[in-house]
Each structure stands twice: as structure tokens, then as C-alpha cells.
């Protein structure tokens, strides 16, 4: 679809005569008839196959024709066509004299013709005007012409329809040849595909409008290049979606089981050394002068009664000091200058000579001890409390303060962690030194068999076209991560538009 445009510029008829040579009275009131038709080697009368147009009276005898002439005429003259421009044409321009106001062919005498010109040739579609001048014995006509495409038609022969659009069926303008030119941010054959945010992961991200990056299931982050770990993953990371790879010191399905209580909680006080001994379990090795499960209790060094033979103990900042009774010396008053003759044994102890009387030994009655039977028996010195229990002197008796998990007079009884049936879903409970262990039936896992083991939804290889399968442990379902070029819940469908326009 296009328009043949004819611009009349000047008509010269100096003598004001008709084609017959007869003069016009009072002058030649001139109008034009134009016939556009298919190419003919010899232009002959007949149907104006490409169209016709007439002008009103444009002037008398000789005149210049203004652009867009007034009086209802148009200059350039428009000859629209609704077909592919063939590139060739024939053109007939007739100048007529109008004696009255009726310009219809049947209202004019045949001898009202002033002049007739006929041309033919090739004409390509384009914006440039071709200037021409035709001269006869009595008249001269100067004009120019061109062929341009109608709105929304493009190409060498105006056959290509293209309408710019900016909606969900395309975002483009039209190039001179009728091809589409995508608006910024759009791509694809119909400029219907948005260009995602720069760096948006090719497989894990997509977009619905330009400069956007929407993440596929299992991925997150501005560029959709960070995997989403398993729901509930506490101290873990992932390299593919729904994983939970535990950080150092953590264990369990959700990495929420503390395997490094020492580092994470620092329970041991006063510079004690901490040792991990299982999940949420630890042992503190106290520095000298401290005691308690967490070495939180400060010991007096005299509490261990280090001074012998009745020596008295004095606490000092850097330890202790023994004040020895007469006849004894040494750091702990352990050396004697006495013999049995000096009756060194107290509390009814009997004396026995040693080394030919150089020194002696006291045999103490029950409840007394010490090299001179000078001390009442400390019931805690024999460490009677088992399993790390703390011995406490209570006058004539003693008492064991047991560590968690132990009971009995001497902390000799292990409290059964299994007594309260901690294993879920029919798990079997085993008592251990530092707690308990559950042996889980098929289909369950976790410290207490509380976790239903996920069925591996990916085991049946449900994803097509080399897609990656991920098991969503929270729903026992799978997610297919499609390679580029495939879509669908199983990546079973290739992406692809029909290959070309149907023009």
C-alpha cells in the first residue's frame, strides 16, 4: 500500500490556445486530469489501472502551481494504491480548458483539451522527487513525482505491513525495511522477551520485564545465584538448593546439634581446659586451686590438709605454708626429729621404732590418721565418690554431690536416660556414659527418631533434557532446574517461537 504523488509546478500556454490551435475566450481556464496505470511500452488509452485524479481550475494560460493549492485542490496530487508497487508505471497528464464551472468529462466539449503528455518508466519507492518537463509546440509543463509507502507499510515495494507496538505482544518500532527494531530492554523475534538484569543467572533466574531478576524455586539473591538451604537449616550452608551442609562443630539434619559446646559456649571458668565429649556434653579440667563441674569454685589449698604431723596450714597468695610443731620440719612437716621415747603418737596411737631408733611410725586407732595420729580421718581423702562426684565433709559423716546423670550414696548409680522413653516412633533406647542413643526404625532419623526420613523424589529421574533434580525434603517432592532452552515442571518442553513472519 502506498501513494504515487504528482507535484505540478508550472504550466506555460503563452498564446492561450487549445490543442486545436483555437484560442480560449477570454483565456484558457486550466485544470488537469491525471491517469496512472501499469507500464506500457507505448502508452495507450484505456483503464487507469493504478488510479485517476482531477484538479480544480489552477490558473489561466500560464501560471505557477503553489503547494497544496487552495480551492479544494491538493498539490502534490495523491494517487493511492493498495497493492505491491511494481516499480514501473505509465502516466498521462491532460490539461483542459473549463468554459464553465462543471469539470466533469461529459460536460466538456472534446476540443476543450489544451495538451496531453504521456510518460512511462521505472520508479523505485523513495522520498526523492523526480523532476520532469514536457514541452509541446504550444505548451510546457514542469512537474515532479515520487512513490512513497502508506503509513505502516515498508520495504522496496510497500508490501511489508508493520505497526509499532509496546504491549505484551511486542515492544518495537519499525525499520525502513519493515523489520522490527526492539525497544530498549527487549529482545527476541517479536521483541517480546525482556532482557533481564545484567548478571542474572541464566538458568536460575528469569524476568518478566527488563532489568528484573526473578528467582526460580530454590534460588535467591539479587542475581539468583545463591541457593536456598533446606527449610530449618540452622548452622549450615548449601551449594545446590535444599541442602544443609553443616558448619564446623554442628551436626544433624538441620545442623542444629551442637558438636562443639566448648567453642560455642565456653562453659569452663577460671582458665580451665574444655574438652567436647559428645552432643552438648563437655568436661572441664580445672587449674590448681579450682573445682566444680565448670571449675567455678575456688579451692583453698589448705583444704587438702597438706601439713603433716600436726602442722598448721596458712593460705598464701601463691600457695600455702606449713607451721610445724616442735620436733618436725620440712615443707609439709614430714620430717621428724623425735623417737618413740618422746611419745610422739597422739590419740592412743602406738609407737614403733624404725632404723635402729633413728625414727618411728605411729599405728593409729580407728578414726585417726597422720604420721602422729594427730588428725581425725577425712572421709573424703579416699575419693569415695564415683563418676566425678564431689565429696563434702559434713562433721563426722561425708556426702557425695553427684554430677548430672549419676545418683546413689557414692554416685555409683547411672541414672537411666532411657527411663522416660525419649525415642520417638518406636526407636530403641541405649544408655551411654554421656547420655543416650536412639536406634531408629526404617523411615525415621534424628537424635530422637523424630525426623521422618524423606523419600528421594529424584530417585525416579523425573526431570528431562539433562535438567538437575532437587528433592524438597519438606514436602517429599522434586524440583527440576531446567537447562537453557527448556521449560515445564519436568523441563519436558523446548522453548521456541514460530520461526518467522507469515508475510
Amino acid at each position: 500500500s502506498g501513494v504515487f504523488q504528482l507535484q505540478l509546478q508550472e504550466f506555460i500556454n503563452e498564446r492561450g490556445v487549445l490543442a486545436s490551435g483555437r484560442p480560449c475566450e477570454p483565456g484558457c481556464r486550466t485544470f488537469f486530469r491525471v491517469c496512472l496505470k501499469h507500464f506500457q511500452a507505448v502508452v495507450s488509452p484505456g483503464p487507469c489501472t493504478f488510479g485517476t485524479v482531477s484538479t480544480p481550475v489552477l490558473g489561466t494560460n500560464s501560471f505557477a502551481v503553489r503547494d497544496d493549492s487552495s480551492g479544494g485542490g491538493r498539490n502534490p496530487l495523491q494517487l493511492p494504491f493498495n497493492f505491491t508497487w511494481p516499480g514501473t508505471f505509465s502516466l498521462i497528464i491532460e490539461a483542459w480548458h473549463a468554459p464553465g464551472d462543471d469539470l466533469r468529462p461529459e460536460a466538456l466539449p472534446p476540443d476543450a483539451l489544451i495538451s496531453k503528455i504521456a510518460i512511462q518508466g521505472s520508479l523505485a519507492v523513495g522520498q526523492n522527487w523526480l523532476l520532469d518537463e514536457q514541452t509541446s509546440t504550444l505548451t510546457r509543463l514542469r512537474y515532479s513525482y515520487r512513490v512513497i509507502c502508506s503509513d505502516n507499510y515498508y520495504g522496496d515495494n510497500c508490501s511489508r505491513l508493520c505497526k509499532k507496538r509496546n504491549d505484551h505482544f511486542g515492544h518495537y518500532v519499525c525499520q525502513p525495511d519493515g523489520n522490527l527494531s526492539c525497544l530498549p530492554g527487549w529482545t527476541g523475534e517479536y521483541c517480546q522477551q525482556p532482557i533481564c538484569l545484567s548478571g542474572c543467572h541464566e538458568q536460575n533466574g528469569y524476568c518478566s520485564k527488563p532489568a528484573e531478576c526473578l528467582c526460580r524455586p530454590g534460588w535467591q539473591g539479587r542475581l539468583c545465584n545463591e541457593c536456598i538451604p533446606h527449610n530449618g537449616c540452622r548452622h549450615g550452608t548449601c551449594s545446590t538448593p535444599w541442602q544443609c551442609t553443616c558448619d564446623e562443630g554442628w551436626g544433624g539434619l538441620f545442623c542444629d546439634q551442637d558438636l562443639n559446646y566448648c567453642t560455642h559456649h565456653s562453659p569452663c571458668k577460671n582458665g580451665a581446659t574444655c574438652s567436647n565429649s559428645g552432643q552438648r556434653s563437655y568436661t572441664c579440667t580445672c587449674r590448681p586451686g579450682y573445682t566444680g563441674v565448670d571449675c567455678e569454685l575456688e579451692l583453698s589449698e589448705c583444704d587438702s590438709n597438706p601439713c603433716r604431723n600436726g602442722g598448721s596450714c596458712k593460705d598464701q597468695e601463691d600457695g600455702y605454708h606449713c607451721l610445724c610443731p616442735p620436733g618436725y620440719y620440712g615443707l609439709h612437716c614430714e620430717h621428724s626429729t623425735l623417737s618413740c621415747a618422746d611419745s610422739p603418737c597422739f590419740n592412743g596411737g602406738s609407737c614403733r621404732e624404725r632404723n635402729q631408733g633413728a625414727n618411728y611410725a605411729c599405728e593409729c586407732p580407728p578414726n585417726f590418721t597422720g604420721s602422729n595420729c594427730e588428725k581425725k580421718v577425712d572421709r573424703c581423702t579416699s575419693n569415695p565418690c564415683a563418676n566425678g562426684g564431689q565429696c563434702l565433709n559434713r562433721g563426722p559423716s561425708r556426702m557425695c554431690r553427684c554430677r548430672p546423670g549419676f545418683t546413689g550414696t557414692y554416685c555409683e548409680l547411672h541414672v537411666s536416660d532411657c527411663a522416660r522413653n525419649p525415642c520417638a516412633h518406636g526407636g530403641t533406647c541405649h544408655d551411654l556414659e554421656n547420655g543416650l542413643m536412639c536406634t531408629c526404625p526404617a523411615g525415621f532419623s534424628g537424635r530422637r527418631c523424630e525426623v521422618r526420613t524423606s523419600i528421594d523424589a529424584c530417585a525416579s529421574s523425573p526431570c528431562f533434557n539433562r535438567a538437575t533434580c532437587y528433592t524438597d525434603l519438606s514436602t517429599d517432592t522434586f524440583v527440576c532446574n531446567c537447562p537453557y532452552g527448556f521449560v515445564g515442571s519436568r523441563c519436558e518442553f523446548p522453548v521456541g517461537l514460530p520461526p518467522s513472519f507469515p508475510w
Partner: antibody, heavy 121, light 104 residues
Framework: EVQLQESGPGLVKPSETLSLTCTVS??????????WGWIRQPPGKGLEWIGD???????YYNPSLKNRVTISVDTSKNQFSLKLSSVTAADTAVYYC?????????????WGQGTLVTVSS | SYELTQPPSVSVSPGQTASITCSGE??????VSWYQQKPGQSPVLVIY???KRPSGIPERFSGSNSGDTATLTISGTQAMDEADYYC?????????FGSGTKVT
């Protein structure tokens, strides 16, 4: 050849939500180059475009219905759905689902057979 | 909102040409589709992108679009062409249908 089939209740009470599903067979709803639309026709009247959706979930709605309409897609079931809330008697119509093709400039080349939904108490 | 106006009805004798118009502001700058709907049936696409025919649509159906008016022409109209005809265009992201023309 692709075929479309609407399904859903034929009677809905005023103020309730109209829900319809269109099942696509003979082709994938995830094919690029197609939008999946809903059009309705009140008895004895003309066609009215409701909205459409792309397989990625992009939706476009008629502004006159926008605050009441939701269109969604389920690629795993090869279906797309229409929900129209707060219905009145004026929403009584035959509801069609259709495939709009990019290469046809948005022309709808395949239609379902339509389902009549009556809004009445 | 954008509106497309069609004459309510057009009468034509068998074998003659029927022309159905569809008017809208600057409609020539938009692509127009035409649908045929027979009683009790779903619409059928007969013209897309102003003047193109889908496969299976007879050559007697043709379309044009310029200025503010699109036209569907049925040459050599047959009895089977008796139906309602709707024009449709896209105004931005919104589909718009004409009011429909009954051809008898």
C-alpha cells in the same frame, strides 16, 4: 491441534467468587509465543476481554475488572484459571478461554467451547 | 477507555459483497482481528493483523485498516456466512472488542 476446555461451577451466589479452570490438551501451556486468555459474553450481548497470562505468570487484566480478577497458571497440570470475586448478576455470561498468538498480532486462534456461569441466589 | 464501534447489522444478498466497518480513534495504527460467531458456537478467527487470513478461512474474507476505520469484506457472500462478526484490537495491554455486527 491444541484444544481448550473450561470447567467450573455453573451457578455462583452473589458476592461470592467465581472460579473457572481451562485445561489445555494437544500442546504445552509453556510454549513461548502464546498468551492464555479469558473472554466472556453475557447472554445476547457482545464479547468482553477479561485478561490473559503468560506461562511465566505475567498477567494482564481489563482495567474495568482489575480489582476483582485473578488469573493464574499451573504449568505442571497444563491449566490456567480465572477467579472473579464479589460477583453480581451482571457477571452472568458464557466464559471462554482462548489462546492468543504473538505471531498473529495477538489474535485468538483457538477457543474453548465456553461455559455458562449464572450468578443467582 | 478505548472503544470500537460497529454497525449493529448488515444485510446482503447471496453472491453479493458485504462490508462491515469497525471505527476507533487512530485504529489504522493498531492491528485488527476479526471473529465470526455463529449461534451457540465459540468465536472463530477469520482475519488477523488487518488483512491476513488464518489457514482454512476462505479467500472471500478480506480485511483492510487505515485512518480510523477497519473493514471486513465478504465477497460472494454465502448463506453459511450468516453470523455475528466482532472486530478486536489491543489498546496498550488491554484487549478491546467491537460491539458486534449481525450479518444476514
Amino acid at each position: 491441534e491444541v484444544q481448550l476446555q473450561e470447567s467450573g461451577p455453573g451457578l455462583v451466589k452473589p458476592s461470592e467468587t467465581l472460579s473457572l479452570t481451562c485445561t489445555v490438551s494437544g500442546g504445552s501451556i509453556s510454549s513461548s509465543g502464546y498468551y492464555w486468555g479469558w473472554i466472556r459474553q453475557p447472554p445476547g450481548k457482545g464479547l468482553e476481554w477479561i485478561g490473559d497470562i503468560y506461562y511465566t505468570g505475567n498477567t494482564y487484566y481489563n482495567p474495568s475488572l482489575k480489582n476483582r480478577v485473578t488469573i493464574s497458571v499451573d504449568t505442571s497440570k497444563n491449566q490456567f484459571s480465572l477467579k472473579l470475586s464479589s460477583v453480581t448478576a451482571a457477571d452472568t455470561a458464557v466464559y471462554y478461554c482462548a489462546r492468543e498468538e504473538v505471531i498473529l498480532g495477538g489474535g485468538a486462534d483457538q477457543w474453548g467451547q465456553g461455559t455458562l456461569v449464572t450468578v443467582s441466589s | 477507555s478505548y472503544e470500537l464501534t460497529q454497525p449493529p447489522s448488515v444485510s446482503v444478498s447471496p453472491g453479493q459483497t458485504a462490508s462491515i466497518t469497525c471505527s476507533g480513534e487512530s485504529l489504522g495504527d493498531k492491528y485488527v482481528s476479526w471473529y465470526q460467531q455463529k449461534p451457540g458456537q465459540s468465536p472463530v478467527l477469520v482475519i488477523y493483523e488487518d488483512s491476513k487470513r488464518p489457514s482454512g478461512i476462505p479467500e472471500r474474507f478480506s480485511g483492510s485498516n487505515s485512518g480510523d476505520t477497519a473493514t471486513l469484506t465478504i465477497s460472494g457472500t454465502q448463506a453459511m456466512d450468516e453470523a455475528d462478526y466482532y472486530c478486536q484490537a489491543w489498546d496498550g495491554e488491554t484487549g478491546v472488542f467491537g460491539s458486534g455486527t449481525k450479518v444476514t
